[in-house]
């Protein structure tokens, strides 16, 4: 088989026939050096998954539940291409599983026990697997058989396709539990009708169901959605209030050596020639000899899944939790109101050591998880491997786009009521050596730059955003002659000044000596012309305050700030000479962990925060010898956010807009992946 062949897996005679037609038609339109199709027939989707894992086939299209199976070891497959529905302008690759209730019914998600439930059908995704999977640990024991546990949880149900003889309560609201449209409460529309008629209290359907059944907004306003955080939202706010976000139909391939680029090249060309309304001879999204052969008949095209996206991220935390609960059937001993330990994400070895010290001192309240980069940490929090970390505003933006929420803010000023008063922010500045007297904001081109890291606020988003507005392109590595911006591509001139050894060179963690505020300032001291840092960085590392050999003899008076009007000012005049105000660093977590992270961190700061006077004899959460490990070293306390509890509200409109403008320059693979899930 030539290297540019994609071996497609078919699961029936009809699929194999369509696959051969696909192969032949592609041959006729694609040059001989382009991608080609070969067909492999297997008896089932699970056999196809195994064949791909064993390198006997390369690709198959799967529903969400099978994407989960494909991801599990030993298969280790990943999503590479998604089918989309709707229009090219507004492509839909996901649907949302929701819980719909009547507006006046007054109960929340955690009060469903004893209510009457309407399901699309037993074993179906939005109508059964997702809601029951998420409620699994609240079901009465024994939880097997599942139908019996569900019947005992709700006071009555309509779950079409259930066994009405063995589980009569599941058919109480729709006598007979018929498994077709002959049952008026079958399917999406049927489950909604069950709610609408007053038979049930809650309907588990998908987000579009209510719009398809109620054209009139006034009618829709009589209904609400139950959210997982035990609040309710209007039905059109399904993106912020759903049980799970579910991919519709996805092509999977091997994680390693999986030909993902070739598969995309093939399918992209296929949709150009044989997509919706393209050809009479062969249609990719049509199945004359069956239904949904190879691809869904309702699909409109394909979108490439970003390479950073693994199956866990693609399926989403809620979906994976629901399916895992159903499959594995394991729950904590007895669900208590007590919080589980918070798993803190630590970057590289230095942070991990401090985190472990915290963990020991926390007496079981904190556990530690390691990752090499901030983005890897965010991904771990998303998928439940970790729970929380404190982030610079630039990463709060990425985390927010990935569905995480800010929960507490670092405060840097001593005040009587620190924990109740989140601050307005700190100043992003450009520092230069006083001796380089000709250097201004207007003649930085060709100079050597020092940045905290790519994607961070003071070190990147603010200065590069301002620069972008001036130069109108993203080639910052051409603007500066060289620099150190940890997180840049290793061959970039913005890694040339970095000091990390070997693989650690230019890494966005403490293994790179020029990483972070202190690192960027050190870069200026030793090699650079300008450093983009926070207003406190120079005083914190001069006058003997940093005992490290490179810093111990530095004097604040030897440095100046660049002002945007082309002038320069002394370091202490940052309030009148800065690039922008930056939002303080903040702790982020998943929505489901928000309350526990808040509670445990407030306890922890009372034990180990700024009230600890002797850090040589006691563990201090906000100290790490100017290395800003886990939290900034100048943190005085972690403050409540009050109503600034979403990333947009926390960062503020101006900053969100600035980072949004810089998105076209973004190299963040995680941001790309998260905006695929939520454009």
């Amino acid at each position: 088989v030539p290297d540019k062949t994609v071996r497609w897996c078919a699961v029936s005679e009809h699929e194999a026939t369509k696959c051969q037609s696909f192969r032949d038609h592609m041959k006729s339109v694609i040059p001989s050096d382009g991608p080609s199709v070969a067909c492999v027939k297997k008896a089932s989707y699970l056999d196809c998954i195994r064949a791909i894992a064993a390198n006997e086939a390369d690709a198959v299209t799967l529903d969400a539940g099978l994407v989960y199976d494909a991801y599990l070891a030993p298969n280790n497959l990943k999503p590479v291409v998604a089918e989309f529905y709707g229009s090219k302008e507004d492509p839909q690759t996901f649907y949302y599983a929701v819980a719909v209730v009547k507006k006046d019914s007054g109960f929340q998600m955690n009060q469903l026990r004893g209510k009457k439930s309407c399901h699309t059908g037993l074993g179906r995704s939005a109508g059964w697997n997702i809601p029951i999977g998420l409620l699994y640990c609240d079901l009465p024991e024994p939880r097997k058989p599942l139908e019996k546990a569900v019947a005992n949880f709700f006071s009555g149900s309509c779950a079409p396709c259930a066994d009405g003889t063995d589980f009569p309560q599941l058919c109480q609201l729709c006598p007979g539990c018929g498994c077709s449209t002959l049952n008026q409460y079958f399917g999406y529309s049927g489950a909604f009708k069950c709610l609408k008629d007053g038979a049930g209290d809650v309907a588990f359907v998908k987000h579009s169901t209510i719009f398809e059944n109620l054209a009139n907004k006034a009618d829709r306003d009589q209904y609400e959605l139950l959210c997982l955080d035990n609040t309710r939202k209007p039905v059109d706010e399904y993106k912020d209030c759903h049980l799970a976000q579910v991919p519709s139909h996805t092509v999977v391939a091997r994680s390693m050596g999986g030909k993902e680029d070739l598969i995309w090249e093939l399918l992209n060309q296929a949709q150009e020639h044989f997509g919706k309304d393209k050809s009479k001879e062969f249609q990719l999204f049509s199945s004359p000899h069956g239904k949904d052969l190879l691809f869904k008949d309702s699909a409109h095209g394909f979108l490439k899944v970003p390479p950073r996206m693994d199956a866990k991220m693609y399926l989403g935390y809620e979906y994976v939790t629901a399916i895992r609960n159903l499959r594995e059937g394991t729950c904590p001993e007895a669900p208590t109101d007590e919080c589980k330990p918070v798993k803190w994400c630590a970057l590289s070895h230095h942070e991990r050591l401090k985190c472990d010290e915290w963990s020991v001192n926390s007496v079981g309240k904190i556990e530690c998880v390691s990752a090499e980069t901030t983005e890897d940490c965010i991904a771990k929090i998303m998928n439940g491997e970790a729970d929380a970390m404190s982030l610079d505003g630039g990463f709060v933006y990425i985390a927010g786009k990935c569905g995480l929420v800010p929960v507490l803010a670092e405060n840097y000023n001593k005040s009587d009521n620190c924990e109740d008063t989140p601050e307005a922010g700190y100043f992003a500045i450009a520092v230069v050596k006083k001796s380089a007297s000709d250097l201004t904001w207007d003649n930085l081109k060709g100079k050597k730059s020092c940045h905290t890291a790519v994607g961070r606020t003071a070190g990147w988003n603010i200065p590069m955003g301002l620069l972008y507005n001036k130069i109108n392109h993203c080639r910052f590595d051409e603007f500066f002659s060289e620099g150190c911006a940890p997180g840049s591509k290793k061959d970039s001139s913005l890694c040339k000044l970095c000091m990390g050894s070997g693989l650690n060179l230019c890494e966005p963690n403490n293994k790179e000596g020029y990483y972070g505020y202190t690192g960027a300032f050190r870069c200026l001291v030793e090699k650079g012309d300008v450093a983009f840092v926070k207003h406190q960085t120079v005083p914190q590392n001069t006058g003997g305050k940093n005992p490290d050999p490179w810093a111990k003899n530095l004097n604040e008076k030897d440095y100046e700030l660049l002002c945007l009007d082309g002038t320069r000012k002394p370091v202490e005049e940052y309030a009148n000479c800065h690039l922008a105000r930056a939002p303080n660093h903040a702790v982020v977590t998943r929505k489901d962990k928000e309350a526990c992270v808040h509670k445990i961190l407030r306890q922890q700061q009372h034990l180990f925060g700024s009230n600890v006077t002797d850090c040589s004899g006691n563990f201090c959460l906000f100290r790490s010898e100017t290395k800003d490990l886990l939290f900034r070293d100048d943190t005085v306390c972690l403050a409540k956010l009050h109503d600034r509890n979403t990333y947009e509200k926390y960062l503020g409109e101006e900053y969100v807009k600035a980072v949004g403008n810089l998105r076209k320059c973004s190299t963040s693979s995680l941001l790309e992946a998260c905006t695929f899930r939520r454009p």
Partner: nanobody, 112 residues
């Protein structure tokens, strides 16, 4: 109440070895983990190694591969085996567990 006693320090040449012990009086010792710290003259106290109740260990970068922390719960003891000692390892070594004050420590001096 629990008290910690550190022993095993001494004067040793560079490249030599020492084995420090941390013995606790009282019960429940180290249930949340034990940390070895050291303090060199005129410097901040710094974490050297730690061991948690499940046996998980971690070390500061400069001692990794040379030092090994271990525990014997039956003897209420945590050990720090120090090999390939360097002059920079000189200092007073203390062990610590949550809720228990620092002990006197044990002096380690590495001569070049």
């Amino acid at each position: 109440e629990v008290q910690l006693v550190e022993c095993g320090g001494g004067l040793v040449q560079a490249g030599g070895s020492l084995r420090l012990s941390c013995v606790a009086s009282g019960s429940g010792f180290g249930i949340n983990g034990v940390i070895w710290y050291r303090q060199a003259p005129g410097k901040q106290r710094e974490l050297v190694a730690l061991i948690k109740s499940d046996g998980y260990t971690n070390y500061r970068e400069s001692v990794k591969g040379r030092f090994t922390i271990s525990r014997d719960d039956a003897k209420n003891t945590v050990w720090l085996q120090m090999n390939a000692l360097e002059p920079e390892d000189t200092g007073v070594y203390y062990c610590k567990t949550p809720g228990v004050p620092f002990g006197q420590g044990t002096q380690v001096t590495v001569s070049s």
